[in-house]
């Protein structure tokens, strides 16, 4: 590429997490170049014998791609010219976790940055009133989690209260034998109160809220990935 002096260019990555079985994004940006044909993107994974992905001269170059990534990777080709080297990873596997390197060569120089990619399973919880129970009971369900999370209940009225004695949590292995369904039941629920079911592992934290009054039930869910930092 005739890079004189081999200048260093800025490459920026963001640590992220992938939900197994779904598609994920490994984020990477760089100082853009005016000519697409002068840009080379290489994605590498620590301890892997082949490349994760290579994009050069405006197209994918996959002759040295490792077989574990075959048919599962793509860059956003139309965004490379503006400095987006992010990688789309299809059907995320548990074994995709690890340290990745985004390596860039342009006519201005070259640069690289590492990112930590965690993999697991996380899903939004749904909290419902269990009308089948003998007493007022709430049931919090989330279909897919891995590794096994912790589940904590909280209430707006009884802030700081420990609900472990009046709740029961179970984990049921899903059919693919990796992820688990999380079910937590909270007993002795009082009316006119907002309860929160918080599910957390080292990858994600999800909260399902339910507000129960005499006239209505309001629900809200929220999911946040942990440790996603540059």
């Amino acid at each position: 590429f005739g890079i004189s002096g081999r200048h260093s260019i800025t490459v920026t990555t963001v640590a992220s997490a992938g939900n197994i079985g779904e598609d994920g994004i490994l984020s990477c940006t760089f100082e853009p170049d005016i000519k697409l044909s002068d840009i080379v993107i290489q994605w590498l994974k620590e301890g892997v014998l082949g490349l994760v992905h290579e994009f050069k001269e405006g197209k994918d170059e996959l002759s040295e791609q490792d077989e574990m990534f075959r048919g599962r990777t793509a860059v956003f080709a139309d965004q490379v010219i503006v400095g987006n080297a992010s990688l789309r990873l299809k059907n995320v596997q548990l074994t995709d976790a690890g340290t990745y390197k985004c390596y860039i060569i342009t006519s201005k120089g070259k640069g690289n940055a590492n990112l930590e990619y965690k993999t697991g399973a996380f899903s939004m919880p749904e909290v419902n009133v269990d009308y089948n129970a003998s007493s007022e009971t709430l049931r919090c369900e989330a279909p897919r989690w891995f590794p096994q999370p912790t589940v904590v209940w909280a209430s707006q009225v009884d802030q700081g209260a420990n609900f472990s004695e009046v709740s029961n949590t179970s984990f049921e292995l899903n059919s693919e034998n990796v992820t688990m369904k999380v079910v937590s039941v909270l007993y002795n629920v009082t009316i006119n109160n907002t309860y929160s079911c918080m599910i957390e592992n080292d990858i994600a934290k999800a909260t399902g809220d339910i507000k129960v009054t005499e006239s209505e039930i309001k629900r809200r869910s929220h999911l946040q990935l942990l440790n996603s930092k540059a």
Epitope: L44, E46, E67, M68, Q93
Partner: antibody, heavy 122, light 107 residues
Framework: EVQLLESGGGLVQPGGSLRLSCAAS????????MSWVRQAPGKGLEWVSA????????YYADSVKGRFTISRDNSKNTLYLQMNSLRAEDTAVYYC???????????????WGQGTLVTVSS | DIQMTQSPSSLSASVGDRVTITCRAS??????LAWLQQKPGKAPKLLIY???SLESGVPSRFSGSGSGTDFTLTISSLQPEDFATYYC?????????FGQGTKVEIK
């Protein structure tokens, strides 16, 4: 100091099985791919198998495919080679070697164990 | 799989001689080629990686060159401790393949 120590070799009958181990120390084991290489008496080196740092990818020479299984336990810093349906031509000194950390960037086969002898004979 | 052919299979040389060993790949392995040295009863030792990069601690009399399919290991001035067998090894595919070896003997 990087050290690799193989064990598990010995005399086995044709058709039999053997499991080799390689205990690693002195480096971040999970960051590196690892390989097994063998050397028949008086012959050259033959690459047998490799495994990625996380264990998600395994690679085999055609001569052992379907008979040998490479694995690793990163919590124990140990590499394994399960050898089934052994043949006389599998007789060799088996070495474990540290493979690459990053494709195209780093050295490989820079550290080797002392080797363990596997003899397949009736 | 990529096949590696080394030549010569053996050679006799004297201390101080310049020695050249060649290695040819059956298909391009870019620059993904290593050279290793092995002495009898010992494990191999890495000398060169990425065709021409000298491994740390290896004397500068060893050098490597080439890319694609043709590679060369040169020992500029053979020393007594250099009498050994030398192997080239490709790592451009998921497999790794060794050449058959070149034995360097004392003339």
């Amino acid at each position: 100091e990087v050290q690799l120590l193989e064990s598990g070799g010995g005399l086995v009958q044709p058709g039999g099985s053997l499991r080799l181990s390689c205990a690693a120390s002195g480096f971040t084991f999970s960051s590196y791919a690892m390989s097994w290489v063998r050397q028949a008496p008086g012959k050259g080196l033959e690459w047998v198998s490799a495994i990625s740092g996380g264990g998600g990818s395994t690679y085999y020479a055609d001569s052992v495919k379907g008979r040998f299984t490479i694995s690793r336990d990163n919590s124990k810093n140990t590499l394994y080679l399960q050898m089934n349906s052994l043949r006389a031509e599998d007789t060799a000194v088996y070495y474990c070697a540290r493979d690459i950390q990053w494709f195209g960037e780093s050295t490989l086969f820079d550290y080797w164990g002392q080797g363990t002898l596997v003899t397949v004979s009736s | 799989d990529i096949q590696m052919t080394q030549s010569p299979s053996s050679l006799s040389a004297s201390v101080g001689d310049r020695v050249t060993i060649t290695c040819r790949a059956s298909q391009s392995t870019r620059s993904w080629l290593a050279w290793l040295q092995q002495k009898p009863g010992k494990a191999p030792k890495l000398l060169i990686y990425k065709a021409s990069s000298l491994e740390s601690g290896v004397p500068s009399r060893f050098s490597g060159s080439g890319s694609g399919t043709d590679f060369t290991l040169t020992i500029s001035s053979l020393q007594p401790e250099d009498f050994a067998t030398y192997y080239c090894q490709q790592y451009g595919s998921y497999s790794r393949t060794f050449g058959q070896g070149t034995k360097v003997e004392i003339k």
